[in-house]
């Protein structure tokens, strides 16, 4: 597949994990491949085995240390190599000079909870997970609410242009079941992308009081 299209994409979670996906047209599903990480100014190096995730796509996580340890900084460059086994030898398939803080994707927000719920509004909070202290407050969030009879894709996006780990949802319908998700993105990094969406939080608005319009 030398003339086929390939893609090697990696993201740093800002703490101790680099997640990589390698895809190549025409590659065999049972091909054995690895990602090797060689930092330019660290004493460690790391390897992970690429495992199939689809027909011609493999993924793995380079675990650099304890989940909340700060293993890389803005000045680090990590040379990432994809190596695949060909007979008895390993062949280098791709190489990337990886700048961790230019290629960020944080973990999904966690610990979503309903702080207060009424008939027409709901206050929800969350926490960010394994996010570097380097960001200080330079984060933004997107949130969406799933209404009955709609899909997540139809849900309008609510943008929070600052590090605000709560939201007050307004104009909700009384006695109605909703679901809520949030994701996070640092402002830093040319190739930085949104985190995965959080696990959905289900909540129900309170019923309207009888004989009263709330």
């Amino acid at each position: 597949a030398v003339n086929g299209t390939s893609q090697f994409t990696c993201f740093y979670n800002s703490r101790a994990n680099i997640s990589c996906v390698w895809s190549q047209d025409g590659a065999l599903q049972d091909t054995s491949c690895q990602v090797h990480a060689w930092p330019d100014r660290r004493r460690w190096n790391q390897t992970c085995e690429l495992l199939p995730v689809s027909q011609a796509s493999w993924a793995c996580n380079l675990i650099l240390g304890a989940p909340d340890s700060q293993k890389l900084t803005t000045v680090d460059i990590v040379t990432l190599r994809v190596l695949c086994r060909e007979g008895v030898r390993w062949r280098v398939m791709a190489i990337q000079d990886f700048k961790p803080f230019e290629n960020l994707r944080l973990m999904a927000p966690i610990s979503l909870q309903v702080v207060h719920v009424e008939t027409h509004r709901c206050n929800i909070s969350w926490e960010i997970s394994q996010a570097s202290h380097y960001f200080e407050r330079h984060l933004e969030f997107e949130a969406r609410t799933l209404s009955p009879g709609h899909t997540w894709e139809e849900a309008p996006l609510l943008t929070l242009k600052q590090k605000q780990e709560w939201i007050c949802l307004e104009t909700l319908t009384p006695d109605t079941q909703y679901e809520f998700q949030v994701r996070v993105k640092p402002l830093q990094g040319e190739f930085t992308t949104w985190s995965p969406w959080s696990q959905p939080l289900a909540f129900r608005t309170k019923p309207a009081a009888l004989g009263k319009d709330t």
Partner: nanobody
Framework: EVQLVESGGGLVEAGGSLRLSCAAS????????MGWFRQAPGKEREFVAA????????LYADSVKGRFTISRDKSKNTVYLQMSGLKPEDTALYYC????????????????WGQGTQVTVSS
């Protein structure tokens, strides 16, 4: 946009040497990894060698390993291909290419291309 201009091609006897240069310019050029490909008459374009801009990590085609050396001069935004032990089968139009992030052996993984410089090896 990124401009890539190759030079250094020519006619050389078998066993001889040549050094190709590829000068990169343009506001969009941003430490892109670079590669060399070649296309002989009537054949498909094939990978020769590639180098990452920052660490200088290299990839080579098996057919040129040990004979060709790719290098780069960051201060001049230029990539070189030093070719020695040239063979008649190395005769081709040599293209310089730039990738956005990753070097591979696949031509489709490279975004920007030069016009090429001709290398002819006589027996």
């Amino acid at each position: 946009e990124v401009q890539l201009v190759e030079s250094g091609g020519g006619l050389v006897e078998a066993g001889g040497s040549l050094r190709l240069s590829c000068a990169a310019s343009g506001r969009a050029f941003n430490n892109f990894p670079m590669g060399w490909f070649r296309q002989a008459p009537g054949k498909e374009r094939e990978f020769v060698a590639a180098i990452t801009w920052i660490s200088g990590s290299t990839l080579y085609a098996d057919s040129v390993k040990g004979r060709f050396t790719i290098s780069r001069d960051k201060s001049k935004n230029t990539v070189y291909l030093q070719m020695s032990g040239l063979k008649p089968e190395d005769t081709a139009l040599y293209y310089c290419a730039a990738a956005l992030k990753t070097i591979t052996r696949g031509q489709h993984d490279y975004t920007y291309w030069g016009q090429g410089t001709q290398v002819t090896v006589s027996s």
